[in-house]
Structure formats: structure tokens, C-alpha cells
């Protein structure tokens, strides 16, 4: 089975760890891979270790365990991940984590602060 | 530098066998899943077999199964290709392709030529 | 089976021009889809997997996107070693199968 917090936040600019965990007492995991909505962020295989699809080599970084940590986020990252783990003899296991990226403290703190800042 | 070198094609009657091979060099061998990718004079891509690097699982296109057996040799850094009860229609040239995460062929080598014809 | 579509199959164009090639699958297939290039004689080789990743050492001219059923492979400014004959083709399941492949002549 697959385990994950279904639903995160994180904050615009800031970074984020997307984490599944799978448990089996027979199948062995020969591959996992993790998708924003339908486009391909990274893949890891027992083979070949991880390749980070180029789209995202700049922002995604493997890691920690068969997880993601996924830098400098954008509003425009909020929506759904999945990992899929490919394993045998038990087949493929999905799942899915929703990432809501909020806008950061600061630019909230910033704009309060501006406002009520004393003249001269 | 990545190398995949087929060889075995040529001339063989209907009915008749061929065995392909594949030489790889440049890449750890046993690590990626591989296939074999034919395409017939003038005509497109048509996918023939693969065999799984993780798992050993072999596929074939329904169009050769029971006829061809896709076979690796880790030890030799090859892939093969017996080809038994050919038909005309079987006629092109055969690459062997690499295919990293069981998901793009990202080298291919430069193809054999298999003509069946009597 | 997954029947790969591309439309056209064929097409003129001239250096320079911005060429757009489509591919429809018959069936959903994630971005479990790549590109190739081929020229006469020649083995195939990879522009784009996973619908829109750059394969290393592809000038930045090719790009993909699309997911689900309809792709796209899109040469921003066409130069005069990218006449050739593009395929797709989707690695969602097996069977694998290849679109039918367009030609891209000089104009």
C-alpha cells in the first residue's frame, strides 16, 4: 500500500517535500515516478538512480528516500502530484499528494507593513 | 560515448531463421531495458520487442509472437533477436534502441537489413 | 492496442518558418509520449521524452507539450538540418506504437 499526506502547503518561493511511502511484505520497488498533474518531474529506478525530467532540473531535487523536494515553488505549482511505484512481483501502486503554494508570509507581512508604516 | 552495433541481417527464404545481435558498449549494459524497433522499406516505425532490465519481462507486438524471441546476454553486453518462420512481410531493418526507465528510446544503433524473399 | 495519429503527414516549409507538428492518441496516455527525428538512412533519434522534456544536446528550437491524448512538437524556427521525418510514439503500455510519421520538405 501507499502511504502520503494528502494534502500540504508551502509558501511561494519557498520549497516543499513531496513523500510517499510504500510497504509491502513482498514486492520489491524497481521504479517510482512522480508526476505534476500529467508532466513527468523526476523518476527513480533500482537500475539507473534518479534522472529529473529537464523541465524541471532546475527546481526538483531527488530526495530524501524515493520523495522530491521541490524548490522555488510558484503559485502555478498548486495542484495535484502522484508517485507511482512500479513493483514486483506486486504490480503498480499510485499515489497522490495535493499541494496548495501559498502566497509567502512576507509579501503579506510586507504589504501590512507599508500600509501602517508612520510618515516621514 | 554510447555504441549499439546490430548485426545478422542479410538474405533468408520464407520459412526461413535468422538471429540478430546487438552489440552495446558504453553504458552500463545490464542497468536499461532494451528493444527492437523495424521499419520496412519506405514505410514508418513499428515497434517488435523489449525485454526489462529490473524484471526480465519480455513483450512482443503481436505481429511476431511465436515467431520471435528477444533474448539478452549480460555477460556480453548483447542483445538478440531469433527470428524463425520469417514472411516477406517481416522484410526491413531492424534497430536495437535503449530504453532508459522502460519509457524513451534515447540511442539506437544504425540497423541491420533482413530481406525475406525467395 | 493505442493508435498514434499525426497529422500532417506531410508538409513544405521554409528556413526560418515555425512548424507545428500534432499527434492524437486513441486513448489517454498520461505524458507517456517522445519524438523522434529521422533522416534518410539514418536511425531515428530522440528530441523529446515525456511529452516535453529536451533530450541533452537538442538545440532549444524543438519543444513539446500536450497530455492525455493530443501533443505537439513544435520547431520554432526551422533550419536546414531539420528536414526530416518526425514520429511520435507512446510508451504507456505495450504494445509500443509510433505515429505514422511527417515529412518536413523545403518549401
Known amino acids: 500500500t501507499i502511504d502520503t499526506k494528502r494534502n500540504i502547503s508551502a509558501e511561494e518561493g519557498g520549497s516543499v517535500i513531496l513523500q510517499c511511502h510504500f510497504s509491502s511484505d513482498t514486492a520489491e520497488v524497481t521504479q517510482v515516478d512522480w508526476k505534476q498533474q500529467d508532466q513527468l518531474l523526476a523518476i527513480y529506478s533500482v537500475d539507473l538512480g534518479w534522472h529529473v525530467a529537464s523541465v524541471f532540473s532546475d527546481r526538483v531535487v531527488p530526495g530524501p528516500s524515493l520523495g522530491l523536494t521541490f524548490q522555488s515553488l510558484t503559485m502555478n505549482d498548486t495542484g495535484e502530484y502522484f508517485c507511482t511505484y512500479h513493483t514486483y512481483p506486486g504490480g503498480i501502486y499510485k499515489g497522490r499528494i495535493f499541494l496548495k503554494v501559498q502566497e509567502s508570509s512576507d509579501d503579506r507581512n510586507g504589504l501590512a507593513q507599508f500600509q501602517t508604516a508612520p510618515l516621514g | 560515448e554510447v555504441q549499439l552495433l546490430e548485426s545478422g541481417g542479410g538474405l533468408v527464404q520464407p520459412g526461413g531463421s535468422l538471429r540478430l545481435s546487438c552489440a552495446a558498449s558504453?553504458?552500463?549494459?545490464?542497468?536499461?531495458?532494451m528493444s527492437w524497433v523495424r521499419q520496412a522499406p519506405g514505410k514508418g516505425l513499428e515497434w517488435v520487442a523489449s525485454i526489462k532490465s529490473s524484471t526480465g519481462t519480455i513483450s512482443y507486438a503481436d505481429s511476431v509472437k511465436g515467431r520471435f524471441t528477444i533474448s539478452r546476454d549480460n555477460s556480453k553486453n548483447t542483445l538478440y533477436l531469433q527470428m524463425n518462420s520469417l514472411r516477406a512481410e517481416d522484410t526491413a531493418v531492424y534497430y536495437c534502441a535503449r530504453v532508459p526507465y522502460d519509457y524513451w528510446m534515447d540511442y539506437w544503433g544504425q540497423g541491420t537489413l533482413v530481406t525475406v524473399s525467395s | 492496442d493505442i493508435q498514434m495519429t499525426q497529422s500532417p503527414s506531410s508538409l513544405s516549409a521554409s528556413v526560418g518558418d515555425r512548424v507545428t507538428i500534432t499527434c492524437r492518441a486513441s486513448q489517454s496516455i498520461s505524458s507517456y509520449l517522445n519524438w523522434y527525428q529521422q533522416k534518410p538512412g539514418k536511425a531515428p533519434k530522440l528530441l523529446i521524452y515525456?511529452?516535453?522534456s529536451l533530450q541533452s544536446g537538442v538545440p532549444s528550437r524543438f519543444s513539446g507539450s500536450g497530455s492525455g491524448t493530443d501533443f505537439t512538437l513544435t520547431i520554432s524556427s526551422l533550419q536546414p538540418e531539420d528536414f526530416a521525418t518526425y514520429y511520435c510514439?507512446?510508451?504507456?503500455?505495450?504494445?509500443?506504437?509510433f505515429g505514422g510519421g511527417t515529412k518536413v520538405e523545403i518549401k
Open positions: 510514439q507512446q510508451s504507456y503500455s505495450t504494445p509500443l506504437t
Open positions: 558504453g553504458f552500463t549494459f545490464s542497468s536499461y531495458s
Open positions: 515525456a511529452a516535453s
